[in-house]
Interface confidence: low
C-alpha cells in the first residue's frame, strides 16, 4: 500500500520511542566511529522532521524515501572524510547505490575500545540521573560494535537492560542483583549478534534462495503440523524482515516483524500448539518468544517420504514443472520428520536429492537411476553424528577450557595464517559447543551443535573477509554455505606454512596478569598457545601440554610471590628457555 510519506507512515506505525531508538541504531551501525552526542543530534533532527510529515504528509521532502532522508542526514557529518576515509565517497552517489556503499563499509571488527563496566553505584547514579540518555547510550554502544545486530531484538535487549537497572538499583545488594543480569544480557547479546550475522551473510553472500531454504528447513522443524503453504508464507515474510534489517531498513524491518508476529498469533491454530504463551506477551517479548519457541510435536500419522519422492512415477514430471517448489516440498517434508537433524544437514540432503534428480531425470530409466537416492543420505547423516559423538567425549574428558585448547591447536594447525586474536576468539567459541550442546540427549545434540558451529564459523568468515590471509579459509567460506563446517573439519595441517620467527616478547608476561579475571587469564594463556603452535606447527600434543602446564605453574607461582614483577622477569626467561628446548625452537 502506497503512502504519500514513508517516514510519516513508519513514525505512526512504530510510535515515537521505537522510531527514535531504531533510527539511532541505524545511524550507529552505519557510522560506527561517530560520538554519541553527534548521533543523538542527528536522530533528534530526523524525528522533528518526521513529526512535520505526520502533521502534513505533503510537506516539503516528506515524499522522499527513507534511504534518501537518512543518507542525506548521514552525509551532513562534518568529519566524514577524516574519520571514515573512502566511505565519504558514498555521499557522491545517488540512491540506491549510496546505501549499498554504506552497507559495504560496515565493519565487523571496528577499532573501538573495549566496553569497561563501571562500578555498580556509578551505573545506578547515571541511570537515575538520566534514564533516557543511559538507555540510548546502551543502544548506541551495542549497535556500533555489532553493525548487523537485529534491530527489533536490540529493542528487546534494551527493555531488559532497563528492567534490570530499575529492579537492582533499589536492591539491598545492588551488585549481587545487577551483575549476573548484565552478564546474561552480554552473553545472550553476543550470541544474538552472531546468529543474525549468519542470516545477513546468507542473504548477502549466497542470495535470497539460500536464506529461504534455511528458513523452510528450520520452520518445518519448528512447526511440523503446519501445511507447506503456511510454512511457505511464513518463509516469504521472514525473508522480507531479515532482508530489510540486513539492508539497513530498520524501520520497515521492525514494522514487518510486528506484522509477522501478529499474523502468527492470529493463526496459531494452523501453525503450532506451542505459541499460546508467547502470544499473550507484549510485542517485543512476543516476537522474541516466537523466534525461540520449542518445536511442536510431529503429527503422528506422517507417511513415508519415499512414496512421493522416490517411488512415484511423477517425480521427474513434478521436478521439471517447478524445480524449486518441488525441492522446497522435499525439504519441508524431510525437516518436519527430523527435528533431530541440523538445518545444514537437511540442506545437504536436499542438495544431494536435487543433484540426483538432475542426473537421473535425463537418464534412459530415471526411476531405476534415482531409486536408491535415500541410500546416499546415510554417510551425510553419519558424518556429523560421529563428529559430535567424538567431540562430546573429548569435551567430557577435558572440560571446557582444555577442550578449547585442543580446538585452538587443531585450528591453528589448519589455518595458521589467521590472526591470533581471531583464532583465540573463534576457537573459544567453538569450544563452547561442549557445554552448550553435549548435555542434550542424542535427539537434540546435532541441531544444537552443528547449527551453532555454523554461526561460529561464520564469525571466522566475516572477520577473515576484512583482511584475507588464507586461501583455505576463503575457499571454505565461499564455496558452499551448508558445507562450511565439513570443509573446515576436513582441513589437515597446512604443510605449506612457514613457521613464525620466535619472538621472546610474545612470551613475556607481567604482574598485571594476576589481577585479571579468570576468563582474561585464560585468554592470555590461549594467546600464548596459538603463538607456540605458529612457531612450532609440528609440535605434538604432549609437547604443547607440557609447555602449557609449565606456563600455568609459572603464572601461579609468580602471582603468589612477594615481588611479582621480578618473579615474572626471572622465571619468565627460564620458562622461555625451557620451552624452546622442549619444542626444539
Amino acid at each position: 500500500d502506497a503512502h504519500k510519506s514513508e517516514v510519516a507512515h513508519r513514525f505512526k506505525d512504530l510510535g515515537e520511542e521505537n522510531f527514535k531508538a531504531l533510527v539511532l541504531i541505524a545511524f550507529a551501525q552505519y557510522l560506527q566511529q561517530c560520538p554519541f552526542e553527534d548521533h543523538v543530534k542527528l536522530v533528534n533532527e530526523v524525528t522533528e522532521f518526521a513529526k512535520t510529515c505526520v502533521a502534513d504528509e505533503s510537506a516539503e521532502n516528506c515524499d522522499k524515501s527513507l534511504h534518501t532522508l537518512f543518507g542525506d542526514k548521514l552525509c551532513t557529518v562534518a568529519t566524514l572524510r577524516e574519520t571514515y576515509g573512502e566511505m565519504a565517497d558514498c555521499c557522491a552517489k545517488q540512491e540506491p547505490e549510496r546505501n549499498e556503499c554504506f552497507l559495504q563499509h560496515k565493519d565487523d571488527n571496528p577499532n573501538l575500545p573495549r566496553l569497561v563496566r563501571p562500578e555498580v553505584d556509578v551505573m545506578c547514579t547515571a541511570f537515575h540521573d538520566n534514564e533516557e540518555t543511559f538507555l540510548k547510550k546502551y543502544l548506541y554502544e551495542i549497535a556500533r560494535r555489532h553493525p548487523y545486530f537485529y534491530a527489533p531484538e536490540l529493542l528487546f535487549f534494551a527493555k531488559r537492560y532497563k528492567a534490570a537497572f530499575t529492579e537492582c538499583c533499589q536492591a539491598a545488594d545492588k551488585a549481587a542483583c545487577l551483575l549476573p543480569k548484565l552478564d546474561e544480557l552480554r552473553d545472550e547479546g553476543k550470541a544474538s549478534s552472531a546468529k543474525q550475522r549468519l542470516k545477513c551473510a546468507s542473504l548477502q553472500k549466497f542470495g535470497e534462495r539460500a536464506f529461504k531454504a534455511w528458513a523452510v528447513a528450520r520452520l518445518s522443524q519448528r512447526f511440523p503440523k503446519a501445511e507447506f503453504a503456511e510454512v511457505s508464507k511464513l518463509v516469504t515474510d521472514l525473508t522480507k524482515v531479515h532482508t530489510e534489517c540486513c539492508h539497513g531498513d530498520l524501520l520497515e524491518c521492525a514494522d514487518d516483524r510486528a506484522d509477522l508476529a501478529k499474523y502468527i498469533c492470529e493463526n496459531q491454530d494452523s501453525i503450532s500448539s506451542k505459541l499460546k504463551e508467547c502470544c499473550e506477551k507484549p510485542l517485543l517479548e512476543k516476537s522474541h518468544c516466537i523466534a525461540e519457541v520449542e518445536n511442536d510435536e510431529m503429527p503422528a500419522d506422517l507417511p513415508s517420504l519415499a512414496a512421493d519422492f522416490v517411488e512415484s512415477k511423477d517425480v521427474c514430471k513434478n521436478y521439471a514443472e517447478a524445480k524449486d517448489v518441488f525441492l522446497g516440498m522435499f525439504l519441508y517434508e524431510y525437516a518436519r520428520r527430523h527435528p533431530d537433524y541440523s538445518v545444514v544437514l537437511l540442506l545437504r540432503l536436499a542438495k544431494t536429492y536435487e543433484t540426483t534428480l538432475e542426473k537421473c531425470c535425463a537418464a534412459a530409466d530415471p526411476h531405476e537411476c534415482y531409486a536408491k537416492v535415500f541410500d546416499e543420505f546415510k554417510p551425510l547423516v553419519e558424518e556429523p553424528q560421529n563428529l559430535i559423538k567424538q567431540n562430546c567425549e573429548l569435551f567430557e574428558q577435558l572440560g571446557e577450557y582444555k577442550f578449547q585448547n585442543a580446538l585452538l591447536v587443531r585450528y591453528t594447525k589448519k589455518v595458521p595464517q589467521v590472526s591470533t586474536p581471531t583464532l583465540v576468539e573463534v576457537s573459544r567459541n567453538l569450544g563452547k559447543v561442549g557445554s552448550k550442546c553435549c548435555k542434550h540427549p542424542e535427539a537434540k545434540r546435532m541441531p544444537c551443535a552443528e547449527d551453532y558451529l555454523s554461526v561460529v564459523l561464520n564469525q571466522l568468515c566475516v572477520l577473515h573477509e576484512k583482511t584475507p590471509v588464507s586461501d583455505r579459509v576463503t575457499k571454505c567460506c565461499t564455496e558452499s554455505l551448508v558445507n562450511r563446517r565439513p570443509c573446515f573439519s576436513a582441513l589437515e595441517v597446512d604443510e605449506t606454512y612457514v613457521p613464525k620467527e620466535f619472538n621472546a616478547e610474545t612470551f613475556t608476561f607481567h604482574a598485571d596478569i594476576c589481577t585479571l579475571s579468570e576468563k582474561e587469564r585464560q585468554i592470555k594463556k590461549q594467546t600464548a598457545l596459538v603463538e607456540l603452535v605458529k612457531h612450532k606447527p609440528k609440535a605434538t600434543k604432549e609437547q604443547l601440554k607440557a609447555v602449557m602446564d609449565d606456563f600455568a605453574a609459572f603464572v601461579e607461582k609468580c602471582c603468589k610471590a612477594d615481588d611479582k614483577e621480578t618473579c615474572f622477569a626471572e622465571e619468565g626467561k627460564k620458562l622461555v628457555a625451557a620451552s624452546q628446548a622442549a619444542l626444539g625452537l
Partner: nanobody
C-alpha cells in the same frame, strides 16, 4: 541490485564471429553466477552458457559446444560470450543473466533461478 546491459549483437554472415558483452552496474559481478540465454524467433527462451562465480566453471548447451566460449572479467565487471562459426539457427535475442548462489539449482540451465536479467541484444546470422 545489479543492472545488466548487453552489447555486441548485430548481423553477421554464417561462419562468422561475434563477441557479446554484458556489463554490470550497481553491484560487483564477482558475487554472481552468470549465464547467457537466447530466444530464437517464435520459440521459448533457452540456455546457452554459464560460468560460476567461484571457480569459473563453464557449462554449455550441446549445440554450441566448441563454438561458443563464455568468460568473465571481474575487474571490469563484465561477462563475455565469444561466438565463432555462427549458424543461421543461432539467430536469436541473447540475454545475459545473473544469480546469487542459490542453495538449490546446481543446474545453471534453469532460467527461473536467475535473479537479474538484461534487456537483450539481437544476433542475426544470414546464410
Amino acid at each position: 541490485h545489479v543492472q545488466l546491459v548487453e552489447s555486441g549483437g548485430g548481423l553477421v554472415q554464417a561462419g562468422g564471429s561475434l563477441r557479446l558483452s554484458c556489463a554490470a552496474s550497481g553491484r560487483t559481478l564477482s558475487s554472481y553466477d552468470m549465464g547467457w540465454f537466447r530466444q530464437p524467433p517464435g520459440k521459448e527462451r533457452e540456455f546457452v552458457a554459464a560460468i560460476t562465480r567461484h571457480d569459473f566453471n563453464t557449462f554449455y548447451r550441446d549445440s554450441v559446444k566448441g563454438r561458443f566460449t563464455i568468460s568473465r572479467d571481474n575487474a571490469k565487471n563484465t561477462v563475455y560470450l565469444q561466438m565463432n562459426s555462427l549458424k543461421s539457427e543461432d539467430t536469436a535475442v541473447y540475454f545475459c543473466a545473473a544469480r546469487l548462489d542459490p542453495i538449490f539449482a546446481s543446474n545453471s540451465e534453469y532460467a527461473p533461478l536467475y535473479d537479474y536479467w538484461g534487456q537483450g541484444t539481437q544476433v542475426t546470422v544470414s546464410s
